[in-house]
């Protein structure tokens, strides 16, 4: 998590700040959504439990050419301890259904808000 300084501020970012910034970015995406997000692209849904940040990145990183989520992809990479590339799915990632990116972002946002309220920043 201390690697998050690269895009948000000059030094290491406290976990609470990093999570708040991710939440703010997802709020921006959902509020500024006029046309269907990423043209209706579909991604694998994830279990919002252990390994959630890497799983979310593994799903979203496959979407290319969608500028609206590029910042989210970068931010999620700061939460994931290992490098994630397109087409890579960990054993934590059960591929049982695909959903639209817009729904994925909404689900992730709701869960992150809950974590923030509960003080779970890692």
């Amino acid at each position: 998590l201390t690697c998050l300084g690269g895009f948000a501020s000059p030094g290491p970012v406290p976990p609470s700040t990093a999570l708040r910034e991710l939440i703010e970015e997802l709020v921006n995406i959902t509020q500024n959504q006029k046309a269907p997000l990423c043209n209706g692209s579909m991604v694998w849904s994830i279990n919002l439990t252990a390994g959630m940040y890497c799983a979310a990145l593994e799903s979203l990183i496959n979407v290319s050419g969608c500028s609206a989520i590029e910042k989210t992809q970068r931010m999620l990479s700061g939460f994931c301890p290992h490098k994630v590339s397109a087409g890579q799915f960990s054993s934590l990632h059960v591929r049982d259904t695909k959903i639209e990116v817009a729904q994925f972002v909404k689900d992730l946002l709701l869960h992150l808000k809950k974590l923030f309220r509960e003080g779970q920043f890692n």
Partner: nanobody
Framework: EVQLLESGGGLVQPGGSLRLSCAAS????????MDWVRQAPGKGLEWVSS????????YYADSVKGRFTISRDNSKNTLYLQMNSLRAEDTAVYYC?????????WGQGTLVTVSS
């Protein structure tokens, strides 16, 4: 330019079968995961099935598991969806999609109507 052309839809009775095809061009078909997505009248998009680039990995929505089979022929740049035991709730426009791309890269769809 990516082009996907679906065919094989039509009117079928409950319990019947149909085989949808999707001819792909404009990209290296064998390198990409592919999806079937459907949209029922007045409803949102619903993912149906996905297949990995080689065809060895297949995935299905619970609503079609055991009834639909996705396959591909990379030598013919064609994606298929074999639909058996069709139900009224399968009535929809079925789209072939290059995975992780928006509907700018989807086909025009083929209508499947299940009715007696």
């Amino acid at each position: 330019e990516v082009q996907l052309l679906e065919s094989g839809g039509g009117l079928v009775q409950p319990g019947g079968s149909l085989r949808l095809s999707c001819a792909a061009s404009g990209f290296t078909f064998r390198d990409y995961e592919m999806d079937w997505v459907r949209q029922a009248p007045g409803k949102g998009l619903e993912w149906v099935s996905s297949i990995g680039p080689s065809g060895s990995e297949t995935y299905y929505a619970d609503s079609v598991k055991g009834r639909f089979t996705i396959s591909r022929d990379n030598s013919k740049n064609t994606l298929y969806l074999q639909m058996n035991s069709l139900r009224a709730e399968d009535t929809a426009v079925y789209y072939c999609a290059k995975a992780y791309t928006g509907f700018g890269y989807w086909g025009q769809g083929t209508l499947v109507t299940v009715s007696s």
